[in-house]
């Protein structure tokens, strides 16, 4: 029996019972908040043998093993993930072993085993033998192993039955429980699983299996499950489903869902019956079960019930974010706000049409309405009273509508309406006039030239860079000297740069009046020559990188024909030098005969130019004398050489600060204080646990459906 | 935890007409599959019908394709099984079922099952 699509059992402990008749669980299984310690004795599930997603298990009160639960549960597929981990084991209060005897194989993912404050038999368990990495796995604050004690079966009575193997450079015996070996496969068998009396399975299984290489005889699939067969690819008109099984076209059309895009069923695509169409990919018509690729992003339609979409917050734009096509009309009105611009652009820059008008008013948080990057089409189905489909109202701050030599919006339908926009030149809104199509439309009122552009520097004159000279991290430039009317008039000039990887930066980018600006911004006073050209020196800046500088002039509100006027530069992108690139990462090295070395590496994480090749250098090195010191015939523990491997063991690090004999007369010494590198690694690993924990309340944590 | 309590069952003529009803405590009973199962006497549980949290998909079993209808009202919490022409064939015990996010056609073990309603069809 298939149980499904995912299972959580929480509050209830008798809502264990949902388990009774599952093999397999297609999805995830929750075990969680159950506060109150029963007794789970009376509760067994031997038939449950596969989880295809992951186990998850926290704060369950009064459970001491999942052995008894899951006798049989022999693998956890990790076809989906919780945060990266298949099995995660968090804050189990009263957890003595884990248990699952019958555990073989977690097919991908890690595993998290956390705050369980009982918790043995945690290192006498090779999860080696169960993940393919183990470099993942996140086994940390559990009860520590000297105070567990764990005994593997028969090594007290001198007569060990479990095998051993090596972890951490530890030859040990691996079990689960006092009473559990933990089973492995004879070494002939390689990566193929097998029974209980090691002979080995069928190369399709996974696990386990009741009979040797018989792909029906599967405790589960390595690839796939098909008519009772474990097979290693679906066979022709069958398609994968949830990562472990083939299933048919009727029975993919008729999987019902109580999500939001079920209307149209699941579909097929690239051998594999799911959900929806992937990422870049579009039904091939409305009832159709096939994809198509989409040309650009692909469509997404949204729609308000109320017809009209106020825009106030970040809050009330994420509710847009992947929209293409808005139906309805959109009333933007954002007075304050952090990173106001890039946050809009994030939840909003993929619109393409509003089917109804456009309303930006009061938003004195905006400088620019490029957030709405993508928008090409304003239908005007719908109009404000007046007939207007773009409607543009006191807006303190608004100096940019678009960027209008890369940009075509075509409003349909309806008029534009423009006031009260003191920074907003007029010449920008006859502009939006003409790439529109609206000229014409609008009547002597709609676009006030009194009260629209009265505070900003509409008459433009252009600044001109003279020289630029770079180095691998400084840039100095100079630009002709402006001259306004009135020369008293002229304050000082702002530089502007930031990095650019690409040419198509705007003055408005990530910019709003709230004090977010992506740009940086440096005051250049006026040369006290007057033939002096001006120029600056940035400083600072990353080698091998291409930046954006621009230049404005800072003037008075000199007025003519009730405009100020201004000067400012093109956008001049410009490279700082090529300079040493930071070292190669990760280097490794092995000897794969007596007369060779294999040595790999990453490349630097700032190559800071094109790396054209590598130097490797090396040298012969004297043998070390340390390991002639020790006889390895003797019995006692063989001295073991640690090397650092970049992480930090956390249990290690909470212990009492160990002494160690420094070698001579100098006697016991303290622990070494913790270096700087050590410091850091310890602070990433407190956030990284915050990140999970917030990630698994805010996954778990929900309001009562009743 | 969901409750389900069915209604409508009872005694009716060959070829006649009976709907069954399906009251759920859950708020959130659009995120849930809703389904009809039946068992005869003496014979084991069948899948009926399955409708989408939605309203908009349905599955029917061959045997009642047809003449059965399923249908549900988000807004007042129920699950319908409206039952035209009915045949002897018909009599069981029809439970309605309930399973969140999703319903795969081989789908038996639902999340939450109510007790039971009892429709006979006969003369």
């Known amino acids: 029996e298939i149980c499904g699509p995912g299972i959580d059992i929480r509050n209830d402990y008798q809502q264990l019972k949902r388990l009774e008749n599952c093999t397999v669980i297609e999805g995830y299984l929750h075990i969680l908040l159950i506060s109150k310690a029963e007794d789970y004795r009376s509760y067994r599930f031997p038939k449950l043998t596969v989880i295809t997603e992951y186990l998850l298990l926290f704060r369950v009160a009064g459970l001491e093993s999942l052995g008894d639960l899951f006798p049989n549960l022999t693998v956890i597929r990790g076809w989906k993930l919780f945060y990266n981990y298949a099995l995660v084991i968090f804050e189990m209060t009263n957890l003595k072993d884990i248990g699952l005897y019958n555990l073989r194989n977690i097919t991908r993912g890690a595993i998290r085993i956390e705050k369980n404050a009982d918790l043995c038999y945690l290192s006498t368990v090779d999860w080696s033998l169960i993940l393919d990495a183990v470099s993942n796995n996140y086994i940390v604050g559990n009860k520590p192993p000297k105070e567990c004690g764990d005994l593997c079966p028969g090594t007290m009575e001198e007569k060990p039955m479990c095998e051993k193997t090596t972890i951490n450079n530890e030859y040990n015996y691996r079990c689960w429980t006092t009473n559990r070996c933990q089973k492995m496969c004879p070494s002939t068998c390689g990566k193929r699983a097998c029974t209980e009396n090691n002979e080995c399975c069928h190369p399709e299984c996974l696990g386990s299996c009741s009979a040797p290489d018989n792909d029906t005889a599967c405790v589960a699939c390595r690839h796939y499950y098909y008519a009772g067969v474990c097979v290693p690819a679906c066979p022709p008109n069958t398609y994968r489903f949830e990562g472990w099984r083939c299933v048919d076209r009727d029975f993919c059309a008729n999987i019902l869902s109580a999500e939001s895009s079920d209307s149209e069923g699941f579909v097929i695509h690239d051998g594999e019956c799911m959900q929806e169409c992937p990422s870049g990919f579009i039904r091939n018509g409305s009832q159709s079960m096939y994809c198509i690729p989409c040309e650009g992003p692909c469509p997404k339609v949204c729609e308000e019930e109320k017809k009209t979409k106020t825009i106030d917050s970040v809050t009330s734009a994420q509710m847009l974010q992947g929209c293409t096509i808005f139906k309805g009309n959109l009333l933007i009105n954002i007075r304050r706000g952090n990173n106001i611009a890039s946050e809009l652009e994030n939840f909003m820059g993929l619109i393409e049409v509003v089917t109804g008008y456009v309303k930006i008013r009061h938003s004195h948080a905006l400088v620019s309405l490029s957030f709405l990057k993508n928008l090409r089409l304003i239908l005007g189905e719908e109009q404000l009273e007046g007939n207007y489909s773009f409607y543009v109202l006191d807006n303190q701050n608004l100096q940019q509508l678009w960027d209008w030599d890369h940009r075509n919006l075509t409003i349909k339908a309806g008029k534009m309406y423009f006031a009260f926009n003191p920074k907003l030149c007029v010449s920008e809104i006859y502009r939006m006039e003409e790439v529109t199509g609206t000229k014409g439309r609008q009547s002597k009122g709609d676009i006030n030239t009194r009260n629209n552009g009265e505070r900003a520097s509409c008459e433009s004159d252009v600044l001109h860079f003279t020289s630029t000279t770079t180095s691998k991290n400084r840039i100095i430039i100079t630009w002709h000297r402006y001259r306004p009317p009135d020369y008293r008039d002229l304050i000082s000039f702002t530089v502007y740069y930031k990095e650019a990887p690409f040419k198509n930066v705007t003055e408005y980018d990530g910019q709003d009046a709230c004090g977010s600006n992506s740009w940086n911004m440096v005051d250049v006073d006026l040369p006290p020559n007057k033939d002096v050209e001006p120029g600056i020196l940035l400083h600072g800046l990353k080698p091998w990188t291409q930046y954006a500088v621009y230049v404005k002039a800072v003037t008075l509100t000199m007025v003519e024909n009730d405009h100020i006027r201004g000067a400012k530069s093109e956008i001049l992108y410009i490279r700082t030098n090529a300079s040493v690139p930071s070292i190669p990462l990760d280097v490794l090295s092995a000897s794969n005969s007596s007369s060779q070395l294999i040595v790999k590496w990453n490349p630097p994480s700032l190559p800071n130019g094109n790396l054209s090749y590598y130097i490797v250098r090396w040298q012969r090195q004297p043998q070390d004398g340390y390991l002639y010191r020790h006889n390895y015939c003797s019995k006692d523990k063989i001295p073991i050489r640690k090397y650092a491997d970049g992480t930090i063991d956390i249990e290690e690090v909470t212990e009492n600060p160990k002494t160690e004999v420094c070698g001579g007369e100098k006697g016991p010494c303290c622990a070494c204080p913790k270096t700087e590198a050590e410091k850091q690694a310890e602070k990433e690993e407190a956030e990284y646990r915050k990140v999970f924990e917030n990630f698994l309340h805010n996954s778990i944590f929900v309001p009562r459906p009743e | 935890e969901v409750q389900l309590v069915e209604s409508g069952g009872g005694l009716v003529q060959p070829g006649g007409s009976l709907r069954l009803s399906c009251a759920a405590s859950s708020r959130t009973f659009s995120s849930f599959v809703m389904s009809w199962f039946r068992q005869a006497p003496g014979k084991g549980l069948e899948f009926v019908s399955a409708i989408s949290g939605s309203g908009s998909r349905a599955n029917y079993a061959d045997s009642v394709k047809g003449r059965f209808t399923i249908s549900r009202d988000n807004s007042k919490n129920t699950l319908y099984l409206q039952m035209n022409s009915l045949r002897a064939e018909d009599t069981a015990v029809y439970y309605c079922?309930?399973?969140?996010?999703?319903?795969?056609?081989?789908?038996?073990?639902?999340?939450?099952w109510g007790q039971g309603t009892l429709v006979t069809v006969s003369s």
């Open positions: 079922a309930a399973n969140p996010r999703r319903a795969t056609p081989d789908l038996t073990q639902y999340a939450y």
